[in-house]
Interface confidence: medium
């Protein structure tokens, strides 16, 4: 019977050796077997599992000229940059006929200086604000003890006596560096040095101080900034749009914001050139030499309505018998809000002024009746928004009243319609 077909006779003439080394080591495991006839494919096992994607090479050398002569087969498994996941028991496996043969095991072990699984990262933190840093290392050999350092000064008397994987820092008032050392029986490894940059705290209590139709005065309370004085604060304002739905935590404004810089102190800024009666969202961040704070949440604000900037136009005051007819047109100047209506004031030379609230109509008829007489009757008209009256027009005279004619009493001749608007309560 051909050699290798009997269970007690192993074809393996060379078994994997042992490798123990530090991370990153490159090593090779080898198996060698001698078989009669066609050489089999050699498989590698780690901890009993076939390695499907093993970096292995197989060399076959015939020992005779006949195909049925013996063959030497050498399989090499290359381990590049040894990692913890590479450790374990390695064997070679071949199928010969109806039998399976497995080599003696070899062992791959890892032992050396500690290896960092996690190192502290650079980050920015707000002044006097708690944060955590992480560091994780492993052997073998175990145990691995950590020692944290701040600005190169150890934070504990000896490795293993201070915080281990997570370092809780209650707050910093200046930019600092942190690193950790990992200690085991083989020696010490030092992590990267993380720079923790101390930025100003987010400003608080952003609020409106005063509102004008085209400007908003806002103020805020600065946050702590450590040993670094604030150099300036930056305010952003963006037109609100109900369709955009700026959320409190939304990271970026939906459109290019209006950006203004404020010297500090005072922590106050007047934002000008705004639209009247318009909703905005504003936010503020403050900057020191180390960089800017985080933005405050977007604060919804609104410029108030203003009064119309000009009087009604083209005022006409004509008299026809016992009636005086007055009409006008909407001001050409900006209304600075929603036009709510018009007020009309008329006055004779020796009579008190009478004020009329006309609503949104643009005409009124004064019915002249009674026993008194009035001369030099003049009429003024002003438009108004919810913010109040705009400028009054210059007095428009009616033609002179003849002596003995009536004291004017007004009434509207035309049937009015109900105002088609609602008030912003």
């Amino acid at each position: 019977a051909p050699r290798g077909t009997q269970a007690e006779e192993s074809p393996f003439v060379g078994n994997p050796g042992n490798i123990t080394g530090a991370r990153g080591l490159t090593g090779t495991l080898r198996c060698q077997l001698q078989v009669q006839g066609e050489p089999p494919e050699v498989h590698w096992l780690r901890d009993g599992q076939i390695l499907e994607l093993a970096d292995s090479t197989q060399t076959q050398v015939p020992l005779g000229e006949d195909e049925q002569d013996d063959w030497i087969v050498v399989s090499q498994l290359r381990i590049t940059s040894l990692q913890l996941s590479d450790t374990g028991q390695y064997q070679c496996l071949v199928f010969l006929g109806h039998q399976t043969f497995v080599s003696q095991p070899g062992y791959v072990g890892l032992e050396g200086l500690p290896y960092f699984l996690e190192e502290p990262e650079d980050r920015t933190v707000a002044a006097n604000t708690p944060f955590n840093l992480s560091c994780q290392a492993q052997g073998p050999p175990e145990p691995v003890d950590l020692l944290w350092l701040q600005d190169a000064v150890p934070l504990a008397t000896a490795p293993g006596h201070g915080p281990q994987r997570s370092l809780h820092v209650p707050g910093l008032n200046k930019t600092s560096s942190f690193s950790c050392e990992a200690h085991n029986a083989k020696g010490v490894t030092t992590s990267r040095t993380a720079t923790i940059t101390v930025l100003p705290q987010q400003p608080r209590n952003l609020h409106l101080v005063s509102r004008q139709p085209t400007e908003l005065e806002v103020a805020w309370t600065p946050g702590l900034s450590g040993i670094y004085p604030l150099t300036h604060c930056t305010l952003q304002a963006v037109l609100s749009d109900d369709g955009m739905g700026i959320q409190a935590g939304e990271p970026d404004p939906p459109e290019e914001p209006l950006t203004s810089q404020a010297s500090v102190p005072p922590h106050q800024l007047r934002l000008g050139s705004l639209h009247p009666h318009t909703p905005y969202h504003i936010r503020v961040a403050c900057t020191s030499s180390q960089g800017p704070s985080s933005w405050t949440h977007w604060l919804p604000v609104e410029t108030p309505e203003g009064v119309p900037l000009g009087p009604p136009e083209n005022i006409s005051a004509t008299r026809n018998g016992s009636q005086a007819f007055v009409h006008w047109q909407e001001p050409r100047a900006p209304l600075q809000g929603t036009l709510l209506g018009y007020r009309l004031a008329y006055q004779g030379q020796d009579t008190p002024e009478v004020l009329m609230d006309i609503g949104l109509r643009q005409e009124v008829t004064l019915e002249l009746q009674g026993d008194g007489s009035v001369s030099n009757l003049t009429v003024c008209v002003a438009a108004y928004t919810a913010a109040g009256d705009g400028p009054w027009s210059l007095p428009v005279p009616l033609e002179a009243w003849r002596p003995g004619q009536a004291q004017p009493v007004h009434q509207l001749v035309k049937e009015p319609s109900t105002p088609a608007f609602s008030w912003p309560w």
Partner: antibody, heavy 120, light 107 residues
Amino acid sequence: EVNLVESGGGVVKPGASLKLSCEASGFTFSNYGMSWVRQTSDKRLEWVASISGGGGRTYYLDNVKGRFIISRENAKNTLYLQMSSLKSEDTALFYCARGARASYFAMDYWGQGSSVTVSS
Amino acid sequence: VIVMTQSHKFMSTSVGDRVSITCKASQDVTTAVAWYQQKPGQSPKLLIYWASTRHTGVPDRFTGSGSGTDYSLTISNVQTEDLAFYYCQQHFTTPLTFGAGTKLELK
């Protein structure tokens, strides 16, 4: 919350003077026209006087013109009614009222009133 | 002077009823009419202005209507808390004038 509080009422003899005050809070006082309205014992409401938000325009009921003066001090959020040459027919509960934004001749908030009695 | 006339000094109603209080102006006031409610011991409260605009917080069972010289305040589904005096006022021009009031009471 809009709040109007009148003070200064009392019992006086005909011909005497009295000054009513109305302290406003809960809104931007200077943005609103204000009025005084009185209510007689027969429950009738009678407008007395009005003043524009800035104080530049004043309007009076004919039979108080020359006797009453409406004024305001926006820095103190206070409306005043100085009454002189009081008559028995001035006896009433005097209300201070805020003009609505849509028409300051419509009064959207009223105080609780200050009583004025003119009697010999 | 514009005279505001409330022809009914008293109106009787029942809870759940619909009632209309009327007011007539002596001349056209272009819908510049306000309605107030006054309960005993309280100051007047604005219900309606510009004839039909409801003041903030006023229940929608109160409805104002009218134009020219004729105006009305309608209370649908009358509640016991609606029993009070109701006054109309023209806010069109000075001198501002009120109606004499209508007392809404239970039948």
